[in-house]
Interface confidence: low
């Protein structure tokens, strides 16, 4: 499942913690808590509730270490608790780190602990009334993140912001091309594609195929943006990044990373009117490449779409639908190139890995 950030995370929140869920709960919202239970823990609580007063709790999730360990789930309406649902297992260990993930679905909450399914809890009250998360008890939290699952892949490609099909040269200069044509976006391998998008209505994403999503006026991506590339790169794998260059931009960069190395560094520099490409291995940069087929394709204050296609011998880069350059692989272990980083003076609107 692809995810995009629904709101800024809460970092190291002090317990007891109560904080707003921006926009309330919506189908597809995933709330993840990472923390550590205290070594003397007896119980802790995560509440999804309406407002800060605690009288209306849509989902009360309450692990209890006593009596062998179990978890209580319940709902409180108008100050009254309903019948408890008890799961007679304890997925948490005292004094140990954990990752607790709540996924809001149409009819229930799904709860994962340390990436394993633990329990589901049927909605007893409309989940869209929930606008607050509250955490208390014997634990310490590192963060609470909020992410929305992205659009179904089959509907996504009609929304890419290319004004025309991407134009790439048929054959690289001086080389025979192994693959004659670029696979167009709608034929990209589905199973490997992750879309990170910003939508105005996460609960109803792409109900009408072909209508582009409305982008929030404020950036929902944090910059620098990091995301894994599932299974790394391989020939025909494509990556698409769309965004807006800030009006006072100096530079930004797109890095395809291989551990601590940067296999491909794409670095538009507005103060130099150049697009620098390079590779960093063992913290050392190689020879820069700056040649362009045409003019500098990025402009301050303008939107852009960058499409990077990984081929067997090179990366091909298109900007706003036009081929910009090729970059021959210097790091050949493509499957180990598994992280995308985008940083600099831009606002991101779409990322597809």
């Amino acid at each position: 499942m692809a995810l995009f950030s629904a709101q800024s995370p809460y970092i190291n929140p002090i317990i007891p913690f109560t904080g707003p869920i921006q926009g309330g709960l919506q189908e597809g919202l995933q709330v993840t808590l990472q923390g550590t239970t205290k070594s003397f823990a007896q119980r802790f609580v995560v509440n999804f509730q309406n407002s800060f007063n605690g009288n209306d709790i849509a989902f009360h999730f309450n692990p209890r270490f006593e009596e062998g360990g179990y978890v209580v789930c319940n709902t409180k309406q108008n100050g009254q608790w309903g019948p408890e649902e008890r799961k007679m297992q304890m997925p948490f260990q005292k004094g140990m780190p954990f990752e607790l993930c709540f996924l809001v679905q149409r009819s229930e909450f799904k709860v994962m602990v340390n990436k394993k399914f633990f329990v589901q809890y049927q909605h007893r009250v409309p989940y869209h009334l929930v606008d607050t998360i509250a955490v208390s008890g014997c634990l310490k939290l590192s963060f609470i993140t909020f992410q929305n699952s992205a659009a179904p892949v089959q509907h996504v490609f009609s929304t890419l912001q290319f004004s025309q099909p991407v134009q790439f040269p048929r054959t690289p200069k001086g080389r025979k091309q192994k693959t004659q044509n670029f696979r167009p976006a709608h034929q990209a391998p589905m199973a490997q594609t992750t879309i990170h998008m910003v939508h105005s209505t996460p609960g109803q994403m792409f109900s009408t195929p072909g209508i582009p999503p409305v982008v929030y006026p404020t950036p929902a991506y944090t910059i620098p943006f990091y995301t894994p590339i599932p299974n790394g790169l391989y020939p025909s794998k494509s990556i698409m990044i769309s965004g807006n260059v800030l009006p006072d931009a100096t530079r930004f960069h797109i890095n395809l990373r291989c551990g601590g190395d940067i296999a491909f560094h794409l670095n538009p520099r507005f103060n130099e009117n150049a697009v620098v490409r390079n590779t960093q291995i063992n913290n050392s940069w190689g020879q820069e490449e700056r040649s362009l087929l045409g003019r500098m394709p990025f402009s301050r204050g303008q939107s852009f779409s960058v499409w990077i296609i990984c081929e067997g011998h090179c990366f091909k880069v298109a900007v706003n639908g036009q081929h910009m350059c090729e970059y021959y692989h210097r790091l050949k272990n493509l499957q180990d190139i598994n992280t995308l980083e985008v940083a600099g003076d831009i606002q991101l609107t779409h990322v597809q890995t």
């Epitope: 944090t222 620098p224 601590g260 003076d345």
Partner: antibody
Amino acid sequence: EVQLVESGGGLVQPGGSLRLSCAASGFTFHSYWIHWVRQAPGKGLEWVARIDSSKFGTYYADSVKGRFTISADTSKNTAYLQMNSLRAEDTAVYYCARSYIDYPVSPAVFDYWGQGTLVTVSS
Amino acid sequence: DIQMTQSPSSLSASVGDRVTITCRASQSVSSAVAWYQQKPGKAPKLLIYSASSLYSGVPSRFSGSRSGTDFTLTISSLQPEDFATYYCQQVYFSPYTFGQGTKVEIK
């Protein structure tokens, strides 16, 4: 409780070696980068090196490149700084710090630090 | 490397004063700037990240702002426990460089 505890500091002669350790507890080690930052007596902070404890990617400041090596042992939740060819100017308190990989804006924001360990390079 | 030029290097102020410390980056670092407080013999403590986001547990009298490549830490009403040295740090490009520090002393 999140804790970072440095050890291994001491007095060493110029050209000598020292290995610092940073024992981490109270958090998921592989979700963080571990950094070493040093502070010479009466001076400011200088970032030295960092390791991505999930992928073991490493970066170094130019001043230590080729002499220092950062590493990590996830089974022990411990990061190390192997310091070779030590010079007088490496004398400092060495701190380890963590930074969450998906921290908003940048994964190099240091939210927890150890208490520091003093390294003195002198003959 | 990106240089972070911090000013002033020291300042004297009284309890209740409004204190402003600035840092200028030698090139664009987006909003990837953090501010730390350090007291003698202690490790630094995070105050501000992302140029203007207040770190959890830090009093609201601390604030940060950005204007291009200029970054500002403001203490709206100085308290006795705020007398310390403050550092800015850019966390945009490795190496993650710090400013040279500003020592806030009692007038």
